[in-house]
Interface confidence: medium
Amino acid sequence: TLNSVLINSNAIKNLPPPLGGAGGQPGSAVSVAPGVLYEGGNKYQTLDNYQPYPCAEDEECGSDEYCSSPSRGAAGVGGVQICLACRKRRKRCMRHAMCCPGNYCKNGICMPSDHSHFPRGEIEESIIENLGNDHNAAAGDGYPRRTTLTSKIYHTKGQEGSVCLRSSDCAAGLCCARHFWSKICKPVLKEGQVCTKHKRKGSHGLEIFQRCYCGEGLACRIQKDHHQASNSSRLHTCQRH
């Protein structure tokens, strides 16, 4: 069962309940397990149980994590996958989701995906399936690994609400974030906007409405006047470094 479910959004005011058949696991209705976080009206409610979060796809993990087996060769076919910390710049990767926000996977290395680095028409990154071993992450876990080949196919960047696979598909000021069962371009958060801070591993779960990260020069921190509030209702906002 899922360890946690988190529902949040950039703009969604009417959040469906985290259960009620809205989301599920393969072959079953979703069931709440310990560690549920549910954001409604900017209040977080949490139940304590911080275990590594099992996942089936990258989108179930936080924006600073990806889904894979915990250690090389630790899991065979059908082995448990968990959310692992993203890889920083210049670290080895096999797909975009492995790289931390602001980076993408190019030639097996996490590179900055700064919009200024791309020509106006943006380089399309074709996804190819690669079943080879990922020597820096999990190998032999039975799941296809994605890597990229860059081909100079120029296209317009996705506007807000456009379908996307990764943030580099979106126009400047937007990121690619989960929205129900797909991903769309959403605005990068501005100063003062509510953000999602995954403080501890396993505390987030599937973000049905995923927020973008804070914009340049901003960090997701507890809002000052919320310091006195209990752990379960601390509000995070994008603030200047």
């Epitope: 393969p26 609400g161 991903k183």
Partner: antibody, heavy 114, light 107 residues
Framework: QVQLVESGGGLVQPGGSLRLSCAAS????????MSWVRQAPGKGLEWVSG????????YYADSVKGRFTISRDNSKNTLYLQMNSLRAEDTAVYYC???????WGQGTLVTVSS | DIQMTQSPSSLSASVGDRVTITCRAS??????LHWYQQKPGKAPKLLIY???NLQSGVPSRFSGSGSGTDFTLTISSLQPEDFAVYYC?????????FGQGTKVEIK
């Protein structure tokens, strides 16, 4: 180009079952969420169900919850809708669609009648 | 559930006319709104996504505007192939819901 082709529709008695299929091509199927949408004869559009790219997460309209099951086989680039306990009001053209309906199939007609 | 109300339910217009269709959501849906065109016996075709973005391959005479609860689809100069039914659809929350449709007929 993106292509979605539905099949499996037909005439079925109330209480019966039917399984719809949607064959996808022209895009990386496993990377996209998919939906089923239906349209009763002469009526408007109704979203039925959605599923994430890996198939791990599913979503249903209240009108079909507990009776319909959405699934996918990414190795076959195919989306499914298993429909059980069918009712007369389920009669409609069923469309499969990519993402939030940015591309649609041509539809398959399901008629529930005795 | 979010109710989507389109107006008018039908309209008659001539080729070259400027046509405006409105869609109102029962609650704030930000810009999570699509506009579709559907012709008889065909699947709907996405025209506008994210309330105001033109889908690739759609003629520029189509435009969308609005945010929150009130949205508009405008056809700047109606062409013969534009006579069809138009639907709005919100994707802000589950269940995703459509407007009842606006039929654009030849005057």
């Amino acid at each position: 180009q993106v292509q979605l082709v539905e099949s499996g529709g037909g005439l079925v008695q109330p209480g019966g079952s039917l399984r719809l299929s949607c064959a996808a091509s022209g895009f990386t199927f496993s990377s996209y969420g998919m939906s089923w949408v239906r349209q009763a004869p002469g009526k408007g559009l109704e979203w039925v169900s959605g599923i994430s790219g890996s198939g791990s997460y599913t979503y249903y309209a209240d009108s079909v919850k507990g009776r319909f099951t959405i699934s996918r086989d990414n190795s076959k680039n195919t989306l499914y809708l298993q429909m059980n306990s069918l009712r007369a009001e389920d009669t409609a053209v069923y469309y499969c669609a990519r993402h939030y309906m940015d591309h649609w199939g041509q539809g398959t007609l399901v008629t529930v009648s005795s | 559930d979010i109710q989507m109300t389109q107006s008018p339910s039908s309209l008659s217009a001539s080729v070259g006319d400027r046509v405006t269709i409105t869609c109102r959501a029962s609650q704030d849906i930000s810009n999570y709104l699509h506009w579709y065109q559907q012709k008889p016996g065909k699947a709907p075709k996405l025209l506008i996504y994210g309330a105001s973005n033109l889908q690739s391959g759609v003629p520029s005479r189509f435009s969308g505007s609005g945010s929150g609860t009130d949205f508009t689809l405008t056809i700047s100069s109606l062409q013969p192939e534009d006579f069809a039914v138009y639907y709005c659809q919100q994707y802000d929350s589950i269940p995703m819901t459509f407007g009842q449709g606006t039929k654009v007929e030849i005057k």
